[in-house]
């Protein structure tokens, strides 16, 4: 003989795989003080409960340790807590209050639990900017994970030098000391939910700030093929009157500011070009000597120089007296 009561709230609840959900249940107000029963949550159509506070009753193997009856008769609470939700938990459930000593029990209405695919992904947060050679703490967090669930397993993947920092149920810290070559490389945080056997990941591209490591000059002479200078050059022969285009490029992130100077500049010298390009339309005596390209960057500067040696055309000298 059963007395029926209605579960408050929605007729169905949705939970994502690996996460938690609370199925709300309140004992009927008509329940007499003398009714000392045990509470049982059942999967519709099953005889073995998924959760109970009856010490003599077995629960289903599949739900043991994941489904818990939150029993508080004073607050009339008979809610069901589900953690580490699995696809096969997708079903209808009902609550039953029963005592073998009493004639009647109390049975609730049914409530459906819908288990959906996990769509949440981990978040990776970086405090400020990543600077080459300086350690930074990256945090991979899963704030949507419930505290009472089986703690997720965090895995990090990166080519950069790293070490693991502290972790909580919902986050893991990775200390990274990036190098210039780690700029634009991938860093992945992978989170596995062992209770449900689900894995999610997020990948970011590292944006590493670093000072210029290399600076080079490409030289374009007339229509001839360009060639590149990678280190300071003592002397580059150039024919008088020839057009010369000097192109300076440097690495560094963010990009370094490139400028050209004639001679070996002091720190506050005025550049002859504020870009990486220096156009010399007609090389003459004024251009003989040193030209310096400076790559300026907040994290450090680098420069490269080349020395122009002008070859004079024979007829050019004779006609000039």
């Amino acid at each position: 003989q059963e007395r029926r009561f209605q579960l408050e709230g929605p007729e169905s609840l949705t939970v994502q795989e690996g996460l938690c959900v609370l199925v709300p249940c309140r004992l009927p107000t008509t329940l007499p003080a003398s009714y000392y029963g045990y509470g049982y949550w059942f999967l519709e159509g099953a005889d073995v409960p998924v959760a109970t506070n009856d010490p003599d009753e077995e629960v289903q193997e599949e739900t043991r340790g994941r489904f818990h009856l939150l029993w508080d008769p004073r607050r009339k609470n008979c809610s069901l807590s589900i953690r580490d939700a699995r696809r096969r938990d997708n079903a209808a459930y009902f609550f039953r209050l029963k005592s073998k000593w009493m004639k009647y029990g109390y049975t609730s209405s049914k409530l459906s639990v819908r288990v959906m695919a996990l769509t949440h992904r981990p978040n990776i947060s970086i405090p400020g900017t990543l600077e080459s050679g300086h350690p930074s703490n990256l945090t991979c967090s899963v704030p949507w994970v419930c505290e009472q669930g089986t703690p997720p397993i965090f895995s990090w993947m990166s080519a950069a030098p790293t070490s693991l920092g502290p972790r909580t149920t919902q986050s893991s810290v990775l200390t990274i000391t990036p190098r210039p070559q780690d700029h634009s490389t991938n860093l992945t945080c992978q989170v596995t939910f062992p209770g449900a056997g689900v894995t999610m990941e997020r990948t970011i591209q590292l944006n590493v700030s670093y000072a210029p490591q290399k600076v080079a000059i490409s030289i374009f002479q007339g229509n001839s093929a360009a060639f590149k200078i990678l280190q300071n050059t003592s002397s580059l022969p150039v024919l008088e009157g020839q057009a010369l285009r000097l192109l300076c490029d440097a690495d560094g992130n963010p990009p370094a500011h490139l400028s050209w100077f004639q001679g070996f500049p002091a720190l506050n010298a005025t550049p002859i070009s504020n870009t990486g390009v220096l156009e010399l339309p007609q090389v003459g005596s004024a251009e003989e000597g040193d030209f310096t390209c400076r790559a300026q960057h907040p994290l450090g500067s680098l420069q490269i120089s080349l020395s122009l040696f002008v070859h004079w055309k024979p007829e050019g000298r004779a006609g000039g007296v």
Epitope: S34, Y35, K100, W101, M102, K103
Partner: antibody, heavy 114, light 107 residues
């Protein structure tokens, strides 16, 4: 008015038997489990036995197991305690109570003495 | 069997005093604990059921708390009619044992 009234107590010699009754009124007796609880003179309460609403489940304290039998007659709204092989230490006031122990009888005194 | 111990076994108090009685179970009994008051020559009276629920008709100066193994009965302001013996009892599982009792008398 909800009421439980015990009867059947008295003076009995060790080794003899006695049957206690508990008459219920004012509630649906057949829906409730029932208890017997006793209290020796100057001592605390001791739970004795419980019976389910239909008599199919019974449980006893170790001190009375095998000697006492709890039973009920739902048609008569009456609970019983059959006490055999009585001992001096069974001397007590015997109370019947409903399953939640929110309703108690006034008790009946059993004295086991030679 | 689940054993219940009560402390203190007796106490002397004055009218208006706050009185606290504790009951400890030998294993977890969730919230399946009840408190009774008994006066000499009378049947016990249910005060608190399910550890903290006040039985209908019982004055609000009585309150219960706890769950698992440790429970407390508190009388916020002792009245003359509260001098009696108090028992805890577990209904978690058979046998349904009682504590040994705490006698509250006048100081």
């Amino acid at each position: 008015e909800v009421q439980l009234v015990e009867s059947g107590g008295g003076l009995v010699q060790p080794g003899r038997s006695l049957r206690l009754s508990c008459a219920a009124s004012g509630f649906t007796f057949s829906s409730y489990g029932m208890h017997w609880v006793r209290q020796a003179p100057g001592k605390g309460l001791e739970w004795v036995a419980v019976i389910s609403y239909d008599g199919s489940n019974k449980y006893y304290a170790d001190s009375v197991k095998g000697r006492f039998t709890i039973s009920r007659d739902n048609s008569k709204n009456t609970l019983y305690l059959q006490m055999n092989s009585l001992r001096a230490e069974d001397t007590a006031v015997y109370y019947c109570a409903n399953y939640g122990m929110d309703v108690w009888g006034k008790g009946t005194t059993v004295t086991v003495s030679s | 069997a689940i054993r219940l111990t009560q402390s203190p076994s007796s106490l002397s108090a004055s009218v208006g005093d706050r009185v606290t009685i504790t009951c400890r179970a030998s294993q977890s009994i969730s919230s399946y604990l009840n408190w009774y008051q008994q006066k000499p020559g009378k049947a016990p009276k249910l005060l608190i059921y399910a550890a903290s629920s006040l039985q209908s008709g019982v004055p609000s100066r009585f309150s219960g708390s706890g769950s698992g193994t440790d429970f407390t009965l508190t009388i916020s302001s002792l009245q003359p009619e509260d001098f009696a013996t108090y028992y805890c009892q577990q209904s978690y599982g058979t046998p349904f044992t009682f504590g040994p009792g705490t006698k509250v008398d006048i100081k």
